[in-house]
């Protein structure tokens, strides 16, 4: 039994780091393997993660952590019984994938304006709480080409857009994701989407030019 692709890990910079790797053949990850992890710090105990299967030869493990500081470093040991298959280390702050925002709500009761709000996925004592920026994706269920992304580069978890920038009388969906420049994170997963009916009344003579905003990171 050998490791084909070494474990790679990402951290939510709060309580969970997820490590994935591939073995050289079909493996029952939960019965054959154990991933031991330990914070390199005083009094820190070694913890055992029982991996789950992630495809035939793939394994995934969710490492639970009480808290995290920028300087944290973990040792990782992958065992198959008494055999040490791989030894490595992991710095959570260098591999951050933020938690997804939640509670996305579209408020349509403000005249001519759509207000989208969502919740910051971190508590105030977490460094990322004040460092997240967001991307909001809005798309039409009727028209696949009507797909837009708004970049929210301020800290407040909300976005106001004129209802008239969207087509009237059709249903739209929105979702939001987050990232933090300070740790050069990857994007979070998208939040669950929310749906609303855009019933803005267009003035008869008004012509719309739809601008599509694209963001690459």
């Amino acid at each position: 039994m050998k490791v084909l692709q070494e474990p790679t890990c990402v951290s939510d910079y709060m309580s969970i780091s997820t490590c994935e790797w591939k073995m050289n053949g079909p493996t029952n990850c939960s019965t054959e393997l154990r991933l031991l992890y330990q914070l390199v710090f005083l009094l820190s105990e070694a913890h055992t993660c029982i991996p789950e299967n992630n495809g035939g030869a793939g394994c995934v493990c969710h490492l639970l952590m009480d808290d995290v500081v920028s300087a944290d470093n973990y040792t990782l040991d992958l065992w198959a019984g008494q055999q040490l298959l791989w030894k490595g280390s992991f710095k959570p702050s260098e591999h951050v994938k933020p938690r997804a925002p939640g509670n996305l709500t579209v408020h349509t009761n403000v005249s001519d304006t759509l207000l989208l709000t969502w919740s910051n996925p971190y508590p105030p004592d977490n460094y990322l709480y004040n460092h997240l920026t967001y991307a909001v994706n809005i798309w039409s269920e009727n028209d696949p080409a009507d797909f837009r992304i708004y970049n929210v580069t301020y800290l407040e978890p909300s976005l106001r857009i004129a209802a008239s920038t969207l087509k009237s009388g059709i249903s739209y969906r929105a979702r939001v994701r987050a990232w933090a420049q300070c740790y050069n994170t990857t994007w979070s997963e998208w939040s669950p989407s929310t749906k609303w009916h855009n019933s803005y009344r267009e003035p008869f003579e008004q012509h719309h030019h739809h601008h599509h905003h694209h963001h690459h990171h």
Partner: antibody
Framework: EVQLVQSGAEVKKPGATVKISCKAS????????MHWVKQAPGKGLEWVGR????????IYASKFQGKATITADTSSDTAYMELSSLRSEDTAVYHC?????????WGQGTLVTVSS | DIVMTQTPLSLSVTPGQPASISCRSS???????????LEWYLQKPGQSPQLLIY???NRFSGVPDRFSGSGSGTDFTLKISRVEAEDVGVYYC?????????FGQGTKLEIK
């Protein structure tokens, strides 16, 4: 041996500012959060605030916002707390504590006396 | 802010007898990561506080096994199975789950 050694007692006049220090040995403060806890004479413990020494991120109890400023110098493994506009109610022993992720190591405390 | 209320505020115990201190939080102290950061500290006369129990039930290294913690939700208890003379001091519960972190008002344990 792990130790947090705090600076000595201070006597200040009302309105003055004091800065007390907490030097860690046996570990690097960048590996922990450094907290400060207030204990007024004959009273209980009161959490003041904390810092992540690596990035300087601080949070405070609302009562101490504007009163306390916590800083840290990772090169000397020292945390500091400055108390401004001192009043008699600020008379207390102030403890520095490292938390990872509980208060395992406490300084011996610094008595700050505010008296005219 | 979460208020931590301890009862009783003082107790006098005969050596060898059990003691129990209750701590109630004004709201849930489950952290967003699922853990409950409820701790117990003892401040012996003239000393800085010392950690006894972390995450509700876990004894810190070097703490005698006569100390135990229990509870969930908003109700927590520290028990000393057989009090010894060296156990005198003020016991504090503490929640480190939600900012601002807060201590209970303290329970003074004396020996009869």
């Amino acid at each position: 041996e792990v130790q947090l050694v705090q600076s000595g007692a201070e006597v200040k006049k009302p309105g003055a500012t004091v800065k007390i220090s907490c030097k860690a040995s046996g570990f690097n403060i960048k590996d922990t959060y450094m907290h400060w806890v207030k204990q007024a004479p004959g009273k209980g413990l009161e959490w003041v605030g904390r810092i992540d020494p690596t990035n300087g991120y601080t949070i405070y109890a609302s009562k101490f916002q504007g009163k306390a400023t916590i800083t840290a110098d990772t090169s000397s493994d020292t945390a500091y707390m400055e108390l401004s506009s001192l009043r008699s109610e600020d008379t207390a022993v102030y403890h520095c504590v490292s938390r990872r992720p509980w208060f395992a190591y406490w300084g011996q405390g610094t008595l700050v006396t505010v008296s005219s | 802010d979460i208020v931590m209320t301890q009862t009783p505020l003082s107790l006098s115990v005969t050596p060898g007898q059990p003691a129990s201190i209750s701590c109630r939080s004004s709201q849930s102290i489950v952290h967003s990561n699922g853990n409950t950061y409820l701790e117990w500290y003892l401040q012996k006369p003239g000393q800085s506080p010392q950690l006894l129990i972390y995450k509700v039930t876990n004894r810190f290294s070097g703490v005698p096994d006569r100390f135990s913690g229990s509870g969930s939700g908003t109700d927590f208890t520290l028990k000393i199975s057989r009090v010894e003379a060296e156990d005198v001091g003020v016991y504090y519960c503490f929640q480190g789950s939600h900012v601002p972190y807060t201590f209970g008002q303290g329970t003074k344990l004396e020996i009869k």
